[in-house]
Every structure is written in C-alpha cells, then in structure tokens.
Interface confidence: medium
C-alpha cells in the first residue's frame, strides 16, 4: 500500500510540474500551444491563486478574532480559600474549593502554599486573613499577616505587613487584616502569607482568602 | 538574614560514603526547591541534585544517579546528600543553594551561597 502512495504521489509531483511548465511556455508565447489552451490553463491557474488567497484572508479573520478574543493577553486570576493546616507552618495552607477562582494554568496553587504565575507583569495581589485572640492567651507581640514575593533565583521579601493587637474579648475576639497592593511579578515568581500564630485564623467560609488579578 | 551552612565534607577512601548537610536560615525553607551543586578544583559549577519543595521529587546528575541520595527535614530546615561509593572524580567543594530552572549555572545567579563543604576522595 505503501508504494502504490508513493507512486500516486510521484504521479501528482510530475502532474504539478508538467502543469508549471505550460504556464511558462504559455507566458513566453510558445506556437506549439493553441491560445485556447492557453487561456484555459491561466484561468485554472487563476482560480488556484484565488482560493489559496481567499483561504488566506479566512485565517487572517480568524487569527484576528482570536486575538480579540484575548488568546494573546489572556485574563490571569486567582483566589483560593483557606484550609487549616495540622503543620505547624507559619505559611497559611489554601485549597481550590468552595467559590474558588483559578482562570487558568498561567498562574497555579503549588503545594496548596503559593501561588505563581507563568508571564510576567503588573498584579495586583491580596490577601484578608481574620483571626480570633485573647490578650492574655496570646505572647506579647501583635498578630502580624505577611505577603511575601518568592522570584526565580532570589529570596523572598516581604511585600505587605499588617498587624493588630489581640483583643480582650473571651475566649477570644475576631479581627480582620486585609492587605492588598500592585506589584511587578516575573515568570516563576510566587506570592504566599505568612501569619505569627496560624492556630489563631479562622477559616469559617469567607473570613480568610488570598488571590491576585494580573492587570 | 538569609544563611546557608554546609557540613559534613572531609577526606574519603574510594567505595566511602559521607552524608553532607545544609543548614538554612532567615527564609521560608519549605516553600522552595533545593540543590546540591559541586565545584571541582579548576573546573566550573556541576549541578548534582535537586529535591522538590515537598521532597517527594528528586533529580539526579547522570554522573551520581544511584549513588548519591538527596533529602530535606522541613521542620528542621535542613538539606541533606547522602554520598555513597565515592569516586576520585566526586572530589570538589559542595553548595546547597535553591534550585530554579534557569539555564546557566553560576554563582552570580543566585543571592544566597554558603560557604560550601569540601569532599576529598583519595586513597
């Protein structure tokens, strides 16, 4: 089956050649054509260079709509929900579950820790964490939320900061810290929260989220 | 202050083994990927060995694939190579440093280096 595809595919070479060939001893007016041959192969000719051109409009439209569609400056977002952790970490745990947002594989939850995005750019970049103290359960030193930017080959630094003093309320009063800023991510970079006391949040359904919106 | 503290290194017969370990300071330790890099005396930067976050994937060098062992206490913030049948060719000075995926590998690439640990293996 094979050869008989190569044969019938030489065949059509030769076929597209012999057809190239006549076109040119058309234009260079050779006698052994007739004029109506002539006539008859440019018009063919003519119709193929239509279509191919014709076809090429079509995928211009196309490709057009695409990019009005934002194929080339897709929207990036993210928001993730807070999931409580067993670990002792001080990185916040978070989870695509409930009315999550993850739009798509440009940015990602890696380790249910931190998000990252693949394309570089300005985001904006939040986080609300609410936590439930007691002034005297707690040390000293206040509550304090961090948003931290982890870059490809760099250390991470500390983006936002927010604190609170703990609340006299018993067993323990809540409070929320919202931080929120616009920051220059490079692809690869990740974002993550860092909290003094984890044991601390609360993660009832909308008290603690964290989330980014490339602009 | 972010800190990097290699240890373990020393002189080692061929067939020996050495168990390497890096101390980290001053950042998140869990969030990031690590690696094992070496420098042998003359020669530019080798990357030998990489473990994943979580530490549940690791990469290996052709050149120690099924001698060399990588790990990492979280909790502890700790990063370790177990080395096993050691040849001449391991002999260098061993880094940990966060591993990316960049192209090239060179000490300018990166913000944070110890001060490195040197193996030595000869008879």
């Known amino acids: 089956h094979r050869r008989l595809d190569k044969i019938e595919d030489e065949r059509n070479l030769h076929e597209d050649f012999v057809f190239m060939k006549t076109i040119q001893r058309c234009n260079t007016g050779e006698r052994s054509l007739s004029l109506l041959n002539c006539e008859e192969i440019k018009s063919q000719f003519e119709g193929f260079v239509k279509d191919i051109m014709l076809n090429k409009e079509e995928t211009k439209k196309e490709n057009s709509f695409e990019m009005q569609k934002g194929d080339q400056n897709p929207q990036i977002a993210a928001h993730v929900i807070s999931e409580a952790s067993s670990k002792t970490t001080s990185v916040l745990q978070w989870a695509e579950k409930g009315y999550y947002t993850m739009s798509n594989n440009l940015v990602t939850l890696e380790n249910g820790k931190q998000l990252t995005v693949k394309r570089q750019g300005l985001y904006y970049i939040y986080a609300q964490v609410t936590f439930c103290s007691n002034r005297e359960a707690s040390s000293q030193a206040p509550f304090i939320a961090s948003l931290c930017l982890k870059s490809p080959g760099r250390f991470e630094r500390i983006l936002l900061r927010a604190a609170n003093t703990h609340s006299s309320a018993k067993p323990c009063g809540q409070q929320s810290i919202h931080l929120g800023g616009v920051f220059e991510l490079q692809p690869g970079a990740s974002v993550f929260v860092n909290v003094t006391d984890p044991s601390q949040v609360s993660h009832g359904t909308g008290f603690t989220s964290f989330g980014l919106l490339k602009l | 202050e972010v800190q990097l503290l290699e240890s373990g290194g020393g002189l080692v017969q061929p067939g020996g083994s050495l168990r390497l370990s890096c101390a980290a300071s001053?950042?998140?330790?869990?969030?990031?990927?690590m690696m094992w890099v070496r420098q042998a005396p003359g020669k530019g930067l080798e990357w030998v060995s990489a473990?994943?976050?979580?530490?549940?994937?690791?990469y290996y060098a052709d050149s120690v694939k099924g001698r060399f062992t990588i790990s990492r206490d979280n909790s502890k913030n700790t990063l370790y190579l177990q080395m096993n049948s050691l040849r001449a060719e391991d002999t260098a000075v061993y880094y940990c440093?966060?591993?990316?995926?960049?192209?090239?590998?060179?000490?300018?690439?990166?913000?944070?280096w110890g001060q490195g640990t040197l193996v030595t293996v000869s008879s």
């Open positions: 440093a966060e591993h990316w995926l960049g192209t090239t590998l060179s000490l300018r690439d990166f913000d944070y």
């Open positions: 473990i994943s976050s979580d530490g549940d994937t690791t």
């Open positions: 001053g950042f998140t330790f869990e969030l990031y990927r």
